[in-house]
């Protein structure tokens, strides 16, 4: 049943809560069999996804999965929004679901989740198994 279709493992409604000023790596998990596809990131602007041309990206290869990473060094308030990765493979374009970044500006600390909110929303504390950033599902 194992197919050699390229798969992008970004789940529908995936979200990340991050702080402005921190470094952050947004991962696009990619499964491929032989030749690594060409992968790009874009940022949604309404219904259009604007390709991110001048941003630092990198690949991280693991045993059964690869990650195409978009680097935020550091996160800026206007990085808030939804992003999508796309893979070109054998003249097919495969698009991921969008993943949303919620950027909290450290200057407005009042907007940061309170202890009570953290207690009631423990997923804010869930740490991704590749990076030490907060996930917000």
């Amino acid at each position: 049943k194992e197919s050699c279709d390229v798969q992008l493992y970004i789940k529908r409604q995936s979200e990340h809560s991050i702080l402005a000023g921190d470094p952050f790596e947004l991962e696009c998990p990619v499964k491929y069999c032989a030749n690594r596809p060409h992968v790009t990131w874009c940022k949604l602007n309404g219904t259009t996804c604007v390709k991110l041309e001048d941003r630092q990206t990198s690949w991280k290869e693991e045993k059964n999965i690869s990650f195409f990473i978009l680097h935020f060094e550091p996160v800026l308030p206007n990085d808030n929004g939804s992003y999508r990765c796309s893979a070109n493979f054998q003249s097919n374009l495969i698009e991921s679901h969008s993943t949303t970044l919620y950027v909290t500006d450290v200057k407005s600390a009042s907007e940061r989740p309170s202890k009570d909110e953290m207690a009631s929303r423990p997923w804010l504390l869930y740490r991704h198994h590749h990076h030490h950033h907060h996930h917000h599902h």
């Epitope: 529908r12 409604q13 499964k31 059964n64 991921s96 869930y126």
Partner: antibody, heavy 121, light 112 residues
Framework: QITLKESGPTLVKPTQTLTLTCTFS??????????VSWIRQPPGKALEWLAH???????RFNPSLKSRLTITKDTSKNQVVLTMTNMDPVDTATYYC?????????????WGQGTLVTVSS | DVVMTQSPLSLPVTLGQPASISCKST???????????LNWFQQRPGQSPRSLIY???KLDSGVPDRFSGSGSGTDFTLKISRVEAEDVGVYYC?????????FGQGTKVEIK
């Protein structure tokens, strides 16, 4: 060979909490793309999706039942556990677990045999 | 929630003849990623559901090619080119584009 099997009580009383376990083999819930859903079917009626857990422990619930449901996984034991609180006779159904495979998003390709749960005093 | 409406609810068929089941959704199932998450399941009497078709028209492994799926947007069809005795059961469509994921009410296929 991929198999899933549901286990738990066949009879629960109203207001009690139901705990069901899905034990599976032939795949790992730590593999990217994998997930397990719980789906139920009241006698003679249609299927209803309840909850899903993904490879990275992310979870999704049917909003109509969300306040009553929890779903957890034990990757080392190849198990997924569903709990449903405050059971009512209308929750009488066959409860299935199904593997969520991935082709751009989840789809169910293997199902367990189901376990009939009756809610009655 | 997206409501999936199947028709007919009961389908008496003659062995060897074709059969067709319709499934309509209250919202388009075309996702923003360009895929349409519409699946079909078969549930034989006394058995658990079995995956037949995913992504509208992809046949799952081990499914005979007399089954086919088609459609787009909100209108979908499952076709059996020549019905066999083992095809008796209830057929469900399912959408995975919108949360919560929802099933149709089922179409019962029986032999005339």
């Amino acid at each position: 060979q991929i198999t899933l099997k549901e286990s738990g009580p066949t009879l629960v009383k109203p207001t009690q909490t139901l705990t069901l376990t899905c034990t599976f083999s032939g795949f790992s819930l730590s593999t990217f793309g994998m997930g397990v859903s719980w789906i139920r079917q009241p006698p003679g009626k249609a299927l209803e999706w309840l909850a899903h857990i993904y490879w990275d422990d992310d979870k999704r619930f049917n909003p109509s039942l969300k306040s009553r449901l929890t779903i957890t996984k034990d990757t080392s034991k190849n198990q997924v556990v569903l709990t449903m609180t405050n059971m009512d006779p209308v929750d009488t159904a066959t409860y299935y677990c199904a593997r969520g495979n991935w082709d751009g998003e989840t789809y169910f390709d293997y199902w367990g045999q189901g376990t009939l749960v009756t809610v009655s005093s | 929630d997206v409501v999936m409406t199947q028709s007919p609810l009961s389908l008496p068929v003659t062995l060897g003849q074709p059969a067709s089941i319709s499934c309509k959704s209250t919202q388009s199932l075309l996702d923003s990623d360009g895929k349409t998450y519409l699946n079909w399941f078969q549930q034989r009497p006394g058995q658990s559901p079995r995956s037949l078709i995913y992504l509208v028209s992809k046949l799952d492994s081990g499914v005979p090619d007399r089954f086919s799926g088609s459609g787009s947007g909100t209108d979908f069809t499952l076709k059996i080119s020549r019905v066999e005795a083992e095809d008796v059961g209830v057929y469900y469509c399912w959408q995975g584009t919108h949360f919560p994921w929802t099933f149709g009410q089922g179409t019962k296929v029986e032999i005339k």
